[in-house]
């Protein structure tokens, strides 16, 4: 590909006050935005969309609604109890013509295990998806349908980062023109063939994902075919050449010393904001050692924090992060020993991440306790283990078969965990609630949009 190729989708990312409340600081929120964008950037860059390669993402602008904005009448996301469709609509009612896509990140528990919602792109004649411009719709409102939303909460629990990253990639996949995967070729996780099944489903699977199977962060051939057609037709409308960092997006990118946003956002005494002249913007002010925008080991007084200060909390699988006294970045935390229990004894630590099932501690692998006749539905939200590659030995941790390891104690999945072979999520009552993949779409059909738009929104 030539350097002049338009392959970068510029994003506008907003976060609501609930997302801020969960993560606690602007810096932590920006770190979340950054990790989500990096994750989808890696997925899309490494996918060959029928000859279209190196599709990348860049944050053009962010807006962080803090808890102080909860009562601000100009903040459209201030309402506490909004359904997922309304939440997407609030995003779509803003004008997002300057962006390829505009997303809102939240920490809301939407109904029925919904983790995100987005408008689906199409090669022609459709409203929605990448590069879509604001226009008037039949309900009399102007809308930008180059939009989506994601939440980090499901049935009262917070989803692991890898799941949230895949949710983001999934919703953006809709914007890029991919419907949900269907058919045996593109839903291998539903296969009866154990070899195929163990690699899991692809990004655009309609229901649940654990995020740790081989296919979980890849696009299926079905998705690639659909996305390729949309990219072919639409990317010249708003994609840009990759290259320069964007001063003002709050993220310190290559070529920038710091980035505290634009003048209306910058609360930083250490960094020149993005409205400053070219030679100064996103540079440290004279005599300042660092900027909090560079990382949590910089004080508001623009000096590196001392050696003993904590910059990251202890987690299930990693010890607390401690500043080293000579950088603003928080050094990597030491991992806790492999096979340490985590996520309330349902998983184990592997290389500092809560990644493996508790079954792995005993040389077993996790499985779904489900009988084809539906008799054992009460066990769908138990952690169940089987001998490697032997589904006939799948039994609950509370069963006599595994009592040598679990002493007859039933370990239940955390609320929000995938269950019943990724068909649903466990709720707080330990019932496996099937995901109705097209529920919000069905509800929107009864709402304000004209019939030709019905097919262009998806979870």
């Amino acid at each position: 590909t030539t350097s002049a190729e338009k392959n970068t989708c510029q994003l506008y990312i907003q976060t609501d006050h609930l997302f801020f409340k969960y993560y606690g600081t602007r810096e932590a929120v920006i770190a979340q935005i950054s990790s989500h964008v990096k994750a989808i950037d890696t997925i899309y860059q490494t996918t060959d969309f029928s000859g279209i390669r190196n599709i990348s993402f860049m944050v053009k602008r962010i807006r962080i609604n803090t808890t102080a904005d909860e009562k601000d009448p100009t903040n459209p996301f201030r309402f506490p109890n909004i359904g997922v469709e309304k939440f997407l609509e609030l995003n779509s009612e803003q004008n997002h013509d300057d962006y390829c896509l505009a997303y809102v990140f939240t920490d809301r528990d939407f109904d029925d295990g919904v983790l995100g919602l987005a408008w689906v792109g199409a090669p022609s004649g459709s409203s929605g998806g990448i590069c879509e411009k604001s226009k008037l719709y039949s309900d009399g409102k102007k809308k930008s349908l180059n939009t989506g939303i994601i939440t980090v909460q499901n049935y009262g629990s917070h989803v692991p980062p890898k799941v949230s990253h895949i949710t983001f990639a999934h919703e953006v996949g809709h914007n890029f023109g991919s419907p949900h995967d269907s058919g045996t070729e593109c839903t291998p996780g539903e296969s009866k063939n154990l070899g195929q099944k163990e690699n899991g489903n692809y990004i655009m699977y309609a229901r649940a994902t654990s995020g740790d199977k081989l296919n979980n962060n890849k696009f299926s051939l079905c998705s690639i075919r659909n996305i390729s057609q949309v990219l072919e037709k639409k990317r010249n409308n708003c994609f840009v050449e990759s290259g320069q960092p964007i001063c003002g997006n709050g993220m310190v990118e290559q070529g920038e010393e710091c980035d505290c946003g634009y003048s209306d956002q910058c609360k930083d005494e250490c960094c020149f904001d993005a409205n400053q002249p070219e030679g100064r913007k996103c540079k440290l002010k004279p005599g300042k050692q660092c900027s909090p925008s560079q990382g949590p080991c910089c004080t508001a007084q623009c000096a590196f924090k001392s050696k003993s200060e904590k910059c990251r909390d202890d987690s299930d699988c990693a010890r607390e992060g401690i500043c080293n006294g000579f950088t603003a970045l928080c050094p990597a935390s030491d991992p806790k020993p492999n096979f340490t229990d985590c996520n309330r004894h349902t998983q184990v630590c592997i290389n500092g991440q809560c990644a493996g099932s508790i079954c792995e501690k005993y040389g077993l692998e996790e499985c779904t306790c489900a009988s084809s006749d539906g008799k054992d539905d009460k066990e769908l939200c138990h952690v169940c283990c089987m001998k490697k590659m032997d589904p006939s030995t799948c039994a609950s941790t509370g069963s006599v078969q595994w009592s040598r390891h679990f002493s007859g104690r039933t370990i239940t999945l955390q609320p929000g965990s995938p269950c019943n072979d990724f068909r649903g999520y466990c709720d707080v009552f330990m019932r496996c609630r099937l995901v109705d993949a097209d529920g919000p779409l069905a509800r929107l059909k009864k709402a304000i949009f004209s019939p030709e738009l019905y097919e262009n929104i998806a979870e």
Epitope: G363, T393, Q401
Partner: nanobody, 123 residues
């Protein structure tokens, strides 16, 4: 190589007793669970009793509770099944099986099996 050898079967009158032995070799005895299973002609293999060698915990099928006792002699790497008050319906080929991970009376969970010993209870 894992080997399990059953012995002690035979013909006995109803109400009588037998003691079956299962001699194990080729693995670390203390890491395993040993189960006794039986299969009558034309019927599926069913679990009778099992023992976890490391902690001596035991488990019995309802049909044999109070009549059969499982035990182990770790020095001899042998598990025993003492069968009292035998009934004609106890007639079957009796197998012992071993597994490093599992426990219980489901034969699917056991990796290693002996050849079996015949027990016949006449009325």
């Amino acid at each position: 190589e894992v080997q399990l050898v059953e012995s002690g079967g035979g013909l006995v009158q109803a109400g009588g007793s037998l003691r079956l032995s299962c001699a194990a070799s080729g693995f670390t005895f203390g890491d395993y669970a040993i189960g006794w299973f039986r299969q009558a002609p034309g019927k599926e293999r069913e679990g009778v009793s099992c023992i976890s060698i490391s902690d001596s915990s035991t488990y019995y099928a309802d049909s044999v509770k109070g009549r059969f006792t499982i035990s182990s002699d770790n020095a001899k790497n042998t598990v025993y099944l003492q069968m009292n008050s035998l009934k004609p319906e106890d007639t079957a080929v009796y197998y012992c099986a071993a597994d490093r991970l599992a426990y219980g009376l489901d034969p699917n969970f056991y990796d290693y099996w002996g050849q079996g010993t015949q027990v016949t209870v006449s009325s």
